[in-house]
């Protein structure tokens, strides 16, 4: 492959000073050393020789020749100092050194940016022996250069525990600009300024940036990378990209969509998951969030009864998990339920309203005005009461449960009676004489048994006593009444 290589006319900043030596245009060594050339023996270096040692590390051997003349310093010859080429091209460069034959086992290693290059690199060392010296040429080739191949390459040779280091060969791989920072998608508040950043690098530098909004250039003249664009605010979604230009051409960043935050869409699919007498568990599918996270939701509950006053109960909850148990509802009632959610911009409209019903519940209050009296002639206890208010029955009454407890001389027994819903009186047989009978009554619906009334006590005398004053549910605040007949 042909190498696109050229030496800079001006010194490269990292390597000041001129870079003598021929430039490479193919894969042959930069310094070819055929035996028949006019190459001077190592002992004959002259100070004016173009290839003389220059800036690399030098080893001065302590060995002398037969004539006892000291050997000259050993150093790598100069080669091209700076190679500039395009990405994906091939390149080959080399180091050369002449080593007196008295030295054995000389090896050359290649280093890049201070690290030895080991393994799968195309490094070849060729030896050209002569009578007194051996010319060694170490070649390094890269078939398709990438940006990661940029850097400073040197050769190292160890002789006599001394290290000889070549001058660096700087490889500069040029290509289209490469983005190190591209604009990011964002969700922004309407008419509020925000920043976008774009950064690209070469080589070659400089890299210049153009900003594009909805396919129109924002800046008519480029700005040096990195560039920050302050967008003065948007009223509708826009797409931004940046163009990075250098001498090799241009690279366009990904286009990013900037969305305008808005109020969310209303939730959809509000559904009833479970109903009890006093609660309804609902779920919903959130609407589009308006490019801003949901903060919380509001459940609105209206009585569906046309005779109700139309007041709305509002329950606030977190946006997750799209589930809410509405509590403190009346039993056996119809409700309209709607859900609305909010983000930082505001509240969504309410979802379509759905109809939901609570189930029957156990009554929430006990029967009222419980009265108990002894009917001695029939040896019965008569009980009368008033049924609880309809609103608080929490369902259709199916009857009552009567608890009567008989206590005398250390004996206590409780009996339960079930009576039908018709009427508001019951008669129970006297179980024990000379005892106290404590009566409590609870209303019953299909939803369950309600609370028991406050206890009413009546004393049942031994046979033959006269009575008949009734015992009643006490007024509030009077505890544990006992009426002794």
């Amino acid at each position: 492959a042909i190498t696109e290589a050229r030496e800079e006319a001006k010194p490269y900043p990292l390597f000041p000073g001129p870079f003598p030596g021929s430039l490479q245009t193919d894969h042959t060594p930069l310094l070819s050393l055929p035996h028949a050339s006019g190459y001077q023996p190592a002992l004959m270096f002259s100070p004016t020789q173009p290839g003389r040692p220059h800036t690399g590390n030098v080893a001065i051997p302590q060995v002398t020749s037969v004539e006892s003349k000291p050997l000259p310093p050993l150093a790598f010859k100069h080669t091209v100092g700076h190679i500039i080429l395009s990405e994906h091209k091939g390149v080959k460069f080399n180091c050369s050194i002449s080593v007196p034959n008295i030295y054995q086992d000389t090896t050359i290693s290649w280093w890049k940016d201070g690290k030895e290059l080991l393994g799968a690199h195309h490094a070849i060392t060729q030896f050209y022996p002569d009578d007194e010296v051996t010319a060694i040429i170490a070649s390094f080739s890269i078939t398709s250069v990438q940006r990661s191949d940029n850097g400073s390459y040197i050769c190292k040779m160890k002789i006599n525990n001394e290290e000889i280091v070549s001058d660096p060969i700087y490889i500069e791989v040029q290509g289209l600009p490469h983005f190190t920072k591209q604009p990011e998608s964002m969700n922004v508040t309407r008419n509020t300024a925000f920043n976008l950043t774009c950064q690209a690098v070469g080589p070659p530098e400089p890299v210049n940036i153009f900003w594009v909004q909805n396919s129109s250039r924002v800046n008519e003249q480029p700005e040096k990378s990195p560039s920050v664009l302050t967008v003065p605010g948007l009223t509708e979604m826009a797409v931004f990209s940046c163009e990075a230009h250098n001498d090799k051409g241009l690279t366009v960043s990904k286009g990013v969509q900037i969305n305008i935050k808005a109020i969310p869409s209303p939730p959809t699919e509000v559904s009833i998951r479970n109903s009890t007498a006093h609660s309804i568990l609902i779920s919903w599918v959130p609407g589009f969030d308006g490019y801003s996270p949901f903060r919380n939701c509001s459940i609105q509950v209206k009585e569906a009864d046309p005779l109700s006053n139309g007041s709305v109960m509002i329950f606030n909850t977190s946006a997750l998990p799209h589930l809410y148990q509405i509590k403190q509802l009346q039993a056996l009632a119809n409700y309209s339920i709607g859900v609305s959610c909010m983000n930082e911009i505001g509240w969504s409209a309410v979802s379509p309203w759905i109809l939901a019903s609570t189930t029957e519940g156990a009554p929430s209050v006990a029967p009222l005005n419980v009265t108990v009296f002894l009917n001695e002639s029939s040896d019965n206890v008569d009980i009368r009461w008033m049924k609880p208010p309809t609103k608080q029955q929490d369902g259709e009454l199916v009857g009552y449960r009567i608890s009567h407890v008989w206590q005398s001389a250390g004996i206590s027994k409780e009996l339960l009676e079930e009576v039908g819903q018709n009427g508001s009186r019951a008669r129970i047989s006297v179980q024990v004489h000379n005892a106290t009978c404590t009566v409590r009554i609870a209303a019953v619906t299909r939803g369950g048994v309600g609370p028991f009334s406050d206890p009413v006590k009546i004393f049942i005398p031994a046979h033959g006593w006269v009575d008949y004053a009734p015992s009643s549910t006490p007024a509030p605040g009077n505890a544990d009444p006992v009426l002794i007949i």
Epitope: N191, V218, Q221, L229, P232
Partner: antibody
Framework: QVQLVQSGSELKKPGASVKVSCKAS????????MNWVRQAPGQGLEWMGW????????TYADDFKGRFVFSLDTSVSTAYLQISSLKAEDTAVYYC???????????WGQGTLVTVSS | EIVLTQSPDFQSVTPKEKVTITCRAS?????MHWYQQKPDQSPKPWIK???NLASGVPSRFSGSGSGTDFTLTINSLEAEDAATYYC?????????FGQGTKLEIK
């Protein structure tokens, strides 16, 4: 601070040429494009076009192609507008205005009145 | 090219009155800029990119709009606001200006 200072008024005969200058100071001249805007007596503003101060490339609005030439001398941070073959209807105040992002003209010259009369 | 039509062309207003100048574009634009010009002066940058007041512009001025309809509003007119106001669109080349709206103080 940013300043755009334009050359003084010109009285020209029809068919002649005129060159209006706009000297910039207070910023790096080659970082911002320079626009030219015309305002005929008692009329509104008309965008004539702009010149890229980095490359020297001019862009002309359709109505200003032909006799109008934008040029630069970056060594003295100056933009020029040259009008050739002047006509009476070229009588106007010509403004230079610095390009900003979104074609926002944050800085204007004081204007140069060019009068074309025989 | 995008044609910008301002209305009204001329308005005579009493101080403290609210003033609205509209600028309608012949097709949708991204931003509208506004400039104020007084007689024998060069235009002054007034409102940038639809709604951003330039430095030194009193807060009684505001700008709004999107798409094809944009407005400049003066909440409570003062004598120093007498001037001609021009809109200018960004988004489509060539750049174009509105014909101007002249405000006069009664």
């Amino acid at each position: 601070q940013v300043q755009l200072v334009q050359s003084g008024s010109e009285l020209k005969k029809p068919g002649a040429s005129v060159k209006v200058s706009c000297k910039a100071s207070g910023y790096t001249f080659t970082n911002y494009g320079m626009n030219w805007v015309r305002q005929a007596p008692g009329q509104g503003l008309e965008w004539m076009g702009w010149i890229n101060t980095y490359t020297g490339e001019p862009t002309y609005a359709d109505d200003f192609k032909g006799r109008f030439v934008f040029s630069l001398d970056t060594s003295v941070s100056t933009a020029y507008l040259q009008i050739s073959s002047l006509k009476a209807e070229d009588t106007a105040v010509y403004y230079c205005a610095r390009y900003g992002h979104y074609a926002w003209f944050a800085y204007w010259g004081q204007g140069t009145l060019v009068t074309v009369s025989s | 090219e995008i044609v910008l039509t301002q209305s009204p062309d001329f308005q005579s207003v009493t101080p403290k009155e609210k003033v609205t100048i509209t600028c309608r574009a012949s097709s949708s634009v991204s931003y509208m800029h506004w400039y104020q010009q007084k007689p024998d002066q060069s235009p002054k940058p007034w409102i940038k990119a639809t709604s951003n007041l330039a430095s030194g512009v009193p807060s009684r001025f505001s700008g709004s709009g999107s798409g094809t309809d944009f407005t400049l509003t003066i909440n409570s007119l003062e004598a120093e606001d007498a001037a001609t106001y021009y809109c200018q669109q960004w988004g489509t080349k060539p750049l174009t200006f509105g014909q101007g709206t002249k405000l006069e103080i009664k």
